[in-house]
């Protein structure tokens, strides 16, 4: 046979293909321990066994076999805190972003068999164990039920639940998406005695209705109570029930602070402080005032009391309260004082220690960077993440503050661990932070490691993506740069993805990928092999992502610049960046495009219609086209109300439809799923109508029965193939 010809390794590398992306060939793994104690955790192995690990004894064994999992087609599990039972979750059926229904089976680990008798109804909307023992709370048909033991008959806590009307223990659409970001609205007290829950009354909320075509002769109509900007909102009430004898007093309502209850308001979160102390957070409908209320159980009254002197007010004078959401408190061991992230006098979000009043808060961190999340507060340490290190807003490092020391000393736990590979971390802590896992998302290959909570010493690599590393050896990956550009007094961070054989002396087509929503961040030091990676690798397109005004973690001046005027600076800053990129000399001015999804679709549409002539073409996937069409909680947070005496004028001026004429000189591809529960198809329908009325030619694609994510495999393949063809045509790239 002919001898093999030696080729230098450099030439054997191939470019990424679209197929690689659509097949998820280069997806990475992370490892999050499912902590069950200070030093023990569970993890689902590659072959679906549930494995128990003890860090200190190095013991590991299968606690639940894959055959047991498979016997009920389980895809998830949950161990009861007394370790006697496991719930197995199957028949997962997605509803909205976080919510889903499922069938649950309870497996008795002592007997090695499923619990028979009083089986759980199906499908269940939410189910969870109590934090102690093996009580179960679950939501079925919008009502909450309690089981004292898995084999016991259930006790029905609420009776008011009604489909699309009243939700107990689970959020309605708008609270799920825009406020709680969870599928649940119930919380056990630490000792499992009390169960707090929210009742959402949607009876007066207008309904969004859209067709779901399915396979039938007639389409189905999906009806969702969905408050758009200015519409009637859900009425919320918080109750707490004593789960030991829930039938005695029944649910006890927690009072709403007076200053909140005087007008429309939101419930924003609940945090148990101790077994008889709870912290509720409320927000005015005009979302610049937040109240944190600490309530105590009065045994003599059998009621929850929320004294006025335990109300803490957080107010923003330059925008909305909080970041994307109002931050939640991290309470100290004393169950009175707490740590919380909010804006300091310079407008940067930092950790503050509140002992009695917010006015007397002690600032714990400071600087022209932001504290992002408090992971854990222990007796002597506070762990948090920030973007302080080396001044890169798109990095995340984990820090420890020794709060026992005076003054508190700060240590960066992650900054120097794997500096080149890892600049963006999250963490997962065991119960009292005796151990923790670090998960690094990039910019290099993600890696998950286990650490000692006292010394921060690395104990073990949990997942290092070796297989992925090996398969990427043969791939010509693009080069990624994160840099900043200045314009006037403004600084914009950008990420540029450059083709593998990039040559500054040549001219390349440029694609701007934009999101740009308030308090979002696109320029992050994370690893990704996705569609834009492919476009750079195979098609030789330069990709740029720019964080303009309104984006997060660079101070309130930058963040609140867009307050009450969405659609202005976000677009302006993308245009500024494009001009700066052109000045760099390697961009072909005749071949510049922009694309975005959701808020990014809104910004890309407005950028294309800016009349600057900068863009040859662009794509908007599932764009918002008017803030009046979007959810009240979101739209009003940033825009106020669409009323004459508030901000109606800018609501009207900031629509995509108002700029229909300006699309005449660009190639525009408009894409939307017809079953989008989030950004309704209505948004694109109105853009299309306006373009037709203006006699402007454009291209469009709808995805029947697809939601905001256009997630089905077939649809995704079609979508990215379609967008690729459109871009290649726009850039005159041969197929």
């Amino acid at each position: 046979r002919p001898s093999r010809v030696y080729k230098p390794e450099g030439n054997t590398k191939r470019a990424l293909t679209l197929k690689d992306i659509l097949n998820g060939t280069f997806s990475y793994k992370t490892y999050f321990p499912n902590w069950i104690s200070e030093q023990e955790y569970l993890h689902q192995s590659e072959d679906d066994n549930i494995v128990f690990y003890n860090i200190e004894t190095r013991e590991s064994y299968i606690i639940l076999s894959n055959s047991t999992m498979k016997s009920v087609n389980a895809t998830d599990y949950g161990l009861s805190p007394d370790r006697q039972f496991v719930y197995l979750e199957s028949d997962y059926s997605k509803l909205w972003r976080y919510s889903y229904t499922a069938t649950y089976y309870i497996y008795d680990l002592q007997n090695g068999e499923f619990v028979r008798g009083y089986e759980l109804p199906r499908p269940i909307q939410y189910l969870c164990w109590s934090p102690v023992g093996s009580k179960l709370a679950y939501v079925y048909q919008n009502n909450i039920y309690l089981k004292q033991r898995p084999g016991d008959p259930p006790f029905q806590i609420t009776y008011t639940g009604r489909e699309n009307r009243i939700f107990n223990g689970i959020p309605d659409w708008v609270y799920e998406e825009e406020m709680l970001a969870t599928k649940y609205a119930l919380w056990w007290s630490p000792d499992g005695k009390f169960l707090a829950y929210v009742e959402f009354n949607d009876s007066d909320i207008p309904i969004i209705a859209y067709s779901y075509y399915g396979d039938g002769q007639y389409p189905r109509t999906i009806n969702i109570p969905y408050p758009k900007a200015g519409a009637k909102n859900p009425v919320v009430r918080v109750f707490i029930v004593d789960t030991t004898y829930p039938h005695h007093v029944g649910p006890m309502e927690v009072p709403v602070p007076e200053m909140i209850a005087s007008s429309d308001y939101y419930f924003s979160w609940l945090t148990w402080v101790s077994s008889e102390r709870v912290c509720l957070q409320w927000l005015k409908r005009v979302q610049n005032v937040s109240v944190l209320s600490i309530c105590d159980f009065r045994e003599d009254w059998h009621a929850w009391e929320c004294p006025k002197n335990q109300e803490h007010v957080e107010e923003s004078r330059t925008g909305w309260a909080g970041g994307f959401f109002v931050s939640t408190p991290a309470f100290s061991q004393d169950a009175t004082s707490y740590y919380k992230i909010f804006s300091d006098k310079d407008g940067y979000k930092h950790i503050h220690y509140i002992k009695d009043t917010v006015e007397n808060a002690i600032q714990i961190t400071s600087g022209k960077w932001e504290a992002i999340y408090i992971f854990r507060v222990t007796q002597d340490s506070l762990f948090y993440s920030s973007n302080e290190f080396e001044g890169y807003p798109g990095r995340r490092n984990i820090y420890r503050i020794s709060i026992g020391n005076s003054p508190p000393s700060k240590k960066c736990v992650t900054c120097h661990l794997r500096k080149e590979r890892c600049q963006y971390y999250t963490a997962s802590f065991s119960y009292k932070a005796k151990y923790y896992a670090l998960v690094c998302y990039g910019p290099g290959l993600p890696i998950s490691t286990l650490h000692d909570g006292r010394t921060d010493q690395e104990i073990q690599v949990l997942e290092e993506n070796k297989e992925l590393e090996n398969s990427l050896r043969n791939i010509q990956l693009p080069k990624v740069e994160i840099k900043k550009l200045k314009d006037g007094g403004l600084t914009f961070w950008y990420k540029m993805i450059l083709p593998p054989q990039f040559d500054r002396s040549k001219k390349y087509p440029l694609l701007i990928q934009v999101y740009g929503g308030p308090c979002s961040q696109s320029v992050k030091s994370v690893f990704a092999v996705n569609w834009i990676t492919y476009l750079a690798s195979k098609e030789g397109i330069v990709i740029a992502l720019v964080d303009g005004r309104g984006t997060a973690f660079q101070g309130d001046k930058f963040l609140h610049a867009v307050y009450r005027k969405l659609g202005v600076y976000e677009v302006e800053d993308q245009l500024t960046a494009v001009r700066k990129f052109i000045e760099m000399g390697f961009i072909d001015e005749e071949r510049i495009a922009i694309w975005g999804w959701s808020y990014g679709g809104y910004v890309s549409s407005l950028a294309l219609a800016s009349g600057t002539g900068l863009f040859k073409c662009g794509i908007a996937v599932a764009p918002v086209s008017s803030w009046e069409y979007y959810a009240s909680i979101y739209s009003e947070r940033f825009m106020g109300l669409p009323t004459k005496d508030d901000n109606l004028e800018h609501y009207k001026n900031s629509t995509v439809m108002a700029r229909a004429e300006y699309f005449r000189n660009v190639d525009y591809l408009l894409i939307h799923g017809t079953a989008d529960d989030n950004v309704h198809f209505q948004n694109s329908a109105q853009i299309a109508k306006a373009l037709v009325n203006a006699q402007v030619d454009f291209q469009a694609m709808w995805y029947s029965d697809q939601n905001h994510g256009i997630l089905s495999g077939r649809s995704q393949n079609h979508l990215y193939t379609h967008m690729t063809h459109f871009l290649k045509q726009c850039f005159s790239l041969s197929d």
């Epitope: 039938h247 005695h248 007093v249 009254w301």
Partner: antibody, heavy 117, light 108 residues
Framework: EVQLLESGGGLVQPGGSLRLSCAAS????????MSWVRQAPGKGLEWVSA????????YYADSVKGRFTISRDNSKNTLYLQMNSLRAEDTAVYYC??????????WGQGTLVTVSS | EIVLTQSPGTLSLSPGERATLSCRAS???????LAWYQQKPGQAPRLLII???TRATGIPDRFSGSGSGTDFTLTISRLEPEDFAVYYC?????????FGQGTKVEIK
């Protein structure tokens, strides 16, 4: 000391109406779910109705549903039972009890309702 | 609804004797929701036992409760003269809450 004092009972003709009251003292009335339980002469106990702490949720036995209405006035520490379309089988001593669906830890002395022509 | 059947209907015993009262449910009741009451002639009922086995405030320790599922028992270890009365079991698991028909403990 916890006290529950019922009033408003008496003789009424079938089809008639009565309003029972229960004055509460010695505990935080507004924080307690309350019930009415009745006992026909020489018979056992029968739960009639319950009301949540703030009066938003009310529950009734099938035998009285649509005819009886439970309510409360937390400012007056008083529980009520409006009884309409009374029948002979509604004849009983009516107790007001502290509790929602069980663990009725305090009871009034009862008020007798007699439905007879 | 859950039907509670008490037995015996009447129990004739002497002071100092042990009384065992039974309560059977038509369907399983979680222990948390099973209570026992005592009623003397011309008086309102009095709460004795909650959660199937926990004595209510001020109840002497000669009263004890046990059982689970569908079978529950109230035991009076040594009958005192004041214990002769009618005893009712009650479930609060399911609406409507229901009472047993009662067991009369009388002096033999």
């Amino acid at each position: 000391e916890v006290q529950l004092l019922e009033s408003g009972g008496g003789l009424v003709q079938p089809g008639g109406s009565l309003r029972l009251s229960c004055a509460a003292s010695g505990f935080t009335f507004s924080s307690s779910a309350m019930s009415w339980v009745r006992q026909a002469p020489g018979k056992g106990l029968e739960w009639v109705s319950a009301i949540s702490t703030n009066g938003n949720y009310t529950y009734y036995a099938d035998s009285v549903k649509g005819r009886f209405t439970i309510s409360r006035d937390n400012s007056k520490n008083t529980l009520y039972l409006q009884m309409n379309s009374l029948r002979a089988e509604d004849t009983a001593v009516y107790y007001c009890a502290k509790g929602w669906l069980g663990n009725f830890d305090y009871w009034g002395q009862g008020t007798l309702v007699t439905v007879s022509s | 609804e859950i039907v509670l059947t008490q037995s015996p209907g009447t129990l004739s015993l002497s002071p100092g004797e042990r009384a065992t009262l039974s309560c059977r449910a038509s369907q399983s009741v979680s222990r948390s929701y099973l209570a026992w009451y005592q009623q003397k002639p011309g008086q309102a009922p009095r709460l004795l036992i909650i959660g199937a086995s926990t004595r209510a405030t001020g109840i002497p320790d000669r009263f004890s409760g046990s059982g689970s599922g569908t079978d529950f028992t109230l035991t009076i270890s040594r009958l005192e003269p004041e214990d002769f009365a009618v005893y009712y079991c009650q479930q609060g698991q399911v609406i409507p809450p229901t009472f047993g028909q009662g067991t009369k403990v009388e002096i033999k």
